[in-house]
Amino acid sequence: GITIPRNPGCPNSEDKNFPRTVMVNLNIHNRNTNTNPKRSSDYYNRSTSPWNLHRNEDPERYPSVIWEAKCRHLGCINADGNVDYHMNSVPIQQEILVLRREPPHCPNSFRLEKILVSVGCTCVTPIVHHVA
Amino acid sequence: GITIPRNPGCPNSEDKNFPRTVMVNLNIHNRNTNTNPKRSSDYYNRSTSPWNLHRNEDPERYPSVIWEAKCRHLGCINADGNVDYHMNSVPIQQEILVLRREPPHCPNSFRLEKILVSVGCTCVTPIVHHVA
């Protein structure tokens, strides 16, 4: 798309090019309205590397509730429904942005924070180290 | 969680209980320093439901670059290294928060936005619908 110069209606800030503190509207716009509402909701049970979801709540963080995946087994479920330890269940992790209240307990002042969350699990071939 | 009284050193805002616009410090605090540095970086190739990662860049979004997973196969890789179509590779999706410049092209004014991203893939048993 075409680059448009800075909007004259922007709020003022000290440094236009590299802001450190910005204004954020917390009325969340959800761009996912057309997606399948079921999404990954039953995959945690049907996967060959099934996982459980654990609730992590922190009132000083926004969003305050994050669900974390923990793989149920070290191995993967085979065609017979048994755990095959020749394969490994591993968490798929993603770095996400959250808002952390700063100073603590302030309702309208935050700092961006990066946290690593486990979203689900996948079954991988193990790395075998051969000893000479 | 426990309600903690509001910090007297908080910046002022019109509505203390339900802020719509808040101040956010963009100096990111990284809480991941003690985690395994490798994270999921090689799982996309070793998984029985391997995926490719596609780069999505949007200068009006923060973070501007997001890498999206796309499953390589409909089926899963079996022990012989072939695709088994009796199983399904499916994306594990997560809703994440990003900041969207609002008004557009403003360097210091954003709105929170929820987007759905595919983080990786997992192998699941298909749901079989039996016709009577």
Partner: antibody, heavy 123, light 106 residues
Framework: EVQLVQSGAEVKKPGASVKVSCKAS????????VHWVRQAPGQGLEWMGV????????AYNQKFEGRVTMTADTSTSTAYMELRSLRSDDTAVYYC????????????????WGQGTLVTVSS | EIVLTQSPDFQSVTPKEKVTITCSAS?????MHWFQQKPDQSPKLWIY???NLASGVPSRFSGSGSGTDYTLTINSLEAEDAATYYC?????????FGQGTKLEIK
């Protein structure tokens, strides 16, 4: 201090492969992509592709698709670029450069570059 | 791919003179970056996102433009500005650079 230190010059025969390394220091390796750019003698700059060390995601210039592989080892903060089936017109200085994934840390541009690695392809 | 054409290819300039380098894109791009490169050195980020000066770049430099036409301007040339300048787009793959403009001091 941010530094990208590349491996030394290489002389290769046509048809061979070369693997150039780029060791990063002074910043969080997974907060930045590593892009590779080359420059033939007396010529301009040519973008080859990018790797995101955090996810392992890669995007290549189609011109090099099938001949190039970019990898990253987060335990040593090192990125690698391997180019196969070398031809004489691959003779160039190969640069690695970082590109920010997060707003607070960089201007969304290739802001630091390695010193370059000269690869000479000659029979 | 988007082709970036810089003009001029070469310019010999007197100190204190005003210099304008243009970069024309074959399709509209959303931002332009500019790099400075001196002989036997790696490129340096000079101007990012069309008009923002990179750290340490003198204020006599400026950048502007939108769509397909972008400009790097040096208000009052100094001897240390002798270098090759490249424009670069990142709006579509593959990312591309202009062919470069070499500035020489008379």
């Amino acid at each position: 201090e941010v530094q990208l230190v590349q491996s030394g010059a290489e002389v290769k025969k046509p048809g061979a492969s070369v693997k150039v390394s780029c060791k990063a220091s002074g910043y969080t390796f997974t907060d930045y992509e590593v892009h590779w750019v080359r420059q033939a003698p007396g010529q301009g700059l040519e973008w080859m592709g990018v790797i995101d060390p955090g996810t392992g995601g890669v995007a290549y210039n189609q011109k090099f698709e099938g001949r190039v592989t970019m990898t990253a080892d987060t335990s040593t903060s090192t990125a690698y670029m391997e180019l196969r089936s070398l031809r004489s017109d691959d003779t160039a200085v190969y640069y690695c450069t970082r590109y920010s994934l997060f707003y607070g840390s960089s201007p969304y541009a290739m802001d630091y570059w390695g010193q370059g690695t000269l690869v000479t392809v000659s029979s | 791919e988007i082709v970036l054409t810089q003009s001029p290819d070469f310019q010999s300039v007197t100190p204190k003179e005003k210099v304008t380098i243009t970069c024309s894109a074959s399709s509209s791009v959303n931002y332009m970056h500019w790099f400075q490169q001196k002989p036997d050195q790696s490129p340096k980020l000079w101007i990012y996102r069309t008009s923002n000066l990179a750290s340490g770049v003198p204020s006599r430099f400026s950048g502007s433009g939108s769509g397909t036409d972008y400009t790097l301007t040096i208000n009052s040339l100094e001897a240390e500005d002798a270098a090759t300048y490249y424009c670069q787009q990142r709006s579509s793959y593959p990312w591309t650079f202009g062919q470069g403009t070499k500035l020489e001091i008379k």
